[in-house]
């Protein structure tokens, strides 16, 4: 599948997941907390203030780093999965905190969490998985 299609498909799936999560959690535009979002890399579910959300590294990094091994399972496609089964000490896990000021930046940043190798196939086609 062409990279743009994968990108758009993941984004569309994310927006659907967020909508379902909003319904489940009773979230609306005026609710306190952090709205679910697609950050152009991965999908973040809505969260209450004080909540830390954990996600597995997105598929993007598996393409950049095919030899990278993650100890955590991928979050399911049909929902946000059980983030309780993820641990920040695991390689391949990224977190964001929901604060009264909104979402924090990812911790660790994606490259550090997901084992990005900047010298891997610098001109290879996989550059364009998301980056085209």
């Amino acid at each position: 599948m062409h990279s743009d299609c994968i990108f758009k498909k993941e984004q569309a799936m994310c927006l659907e997941k967020i909508q379902r999560a909003n319904e489940l959690m009773g979230f609306n535009d005026s609710s306190p907390g952090c709205p679910g979002m697609w950050d152009n890399i991965t999908c973040w579910k809505p969260a209450h203030v004080g909540e830390m959300v954990l996600v597995s590294c997105p598929e993007l990094f598996r393409i950049f780093n095919p030899d990278q091994v993650w100890e955590t399972e991928t979050i399911g496609e049909s929902d946000f999965g059980d983030s309780n089964s993820l641990d920040l000490s695991d390689m391949g896990v990224v977190s964001r905190n929901c604060t009264e000021d909104g979402w924090s930046e990812p911790f660790p940043h994606y490259f550090d969490a997901c084992g990005f190798d900047e010298y891997e196939s610098e001109t290879g086609d996989q550059d364009y998985y998301y980056l085209s």
């Epitope: 152009n40 890399i41 604060t99 930046e105 940043h109 994606y110 980056l131």
Partner: antibody
């Protein structure tokens, strides 16, 4: 090796505009976020702006919001900072730095800077 | 925005002595706190990432600790080339910010 070379600095009058450039080499530019950080003479570092790998996300310090615009041309491996309505307090050495991430990251490699002097 | 405060502003020490630099954040930044060294006429250099993670090429005498709002950079035994200005930087919340710096000079 990673190399970042800033250009476009100079002396400019208050209220005028200037565009800084940063030429990147030694890494896959299109995969990395990029930052601008400035340093007034004899002062500390001040974070100015960051742009994500594809230019889709841009964030600014309050002191420059609405006046400065960060942009990039991945086909030319070049980062830009368009500075409008310049003030005396914008006088500084402007560094471009690579962000170690797709989205923002922390600056890990820095250029040598280009000096902007705002004076009448 | 998150304000970073560094202390002391200046630290006067002799080569071989231990340097302890402090950085305090106005709100929790978790461990998204990084340390930079800047020598006169040079660009900053990344020393420590995520409060305590060392980087290749950085001497082992540099170490970091802390989380939340209080962080420390320690130089176990100062070498002549370590006399410089040190900045902390948070990448937890936008807009990102730097501390005002601590100058380590020769006593």
């Amino acid at each position: 090796q990673v190399q970042l070379v800033e250009s476009g600095g100079g002396v400019v009058q208050p209220g005028r505009s200037l565009r800084l450039s940063c030429a990147a080499s030694g890494f896959t530019f299109s995969r990395f976020a990029m930052h601008w950080v400035r340093q007034a003479p004899g002062k500390g570092l001040e974070w100015v702006a960051v742009i994500s790998y594809d230019g889709g996300n841009k964030y600014y310090a309050e002191s420059v919001k609405g006046r400065f615009t960060i942009s990039r041309d991945n086909s030319k491996n070049t980062l830009y900072l368009q500075m409008n309505s310049l003030r005396a307090e914008d006088t500084a050495l402007f560094y471009c730095a690579r962000g170690y991430d797709f989205l923002t990251g922390y600056p890990d490699y820095w250029g040598q800077g280009t000096l902007v002097t705002v004076s009448s | 925005e998150i304000v970073l405060t560094q202390s002391p502003a200046t630290l006067s020490l002799s080569p071989g002595e231990r340097a302890t630099l402090s950085c305090r954040a106005s709100k929790s930044v978790g461990r998204s706190l990084h340390w930079y060294q800047q020598k006169p006429g040079q660009a900053p250099r990344l020393l420590i990432k995520y409060a305590s993670q060392s980087l290749s090429g950085i001497p082992a005498r540099f170490s970091g600790s802390g989380s939340g709002t209080d962080f420390t950079l320690t130089i176990s035994s100062l070498e002549p080339e370590d006399f410089a200005v040190y900045y902390c930087h948070q990448s937890s919340r936008l807009p990102f910010t730097f501390g005002p710096g601590t100058k380590v000079d020769i006593k």
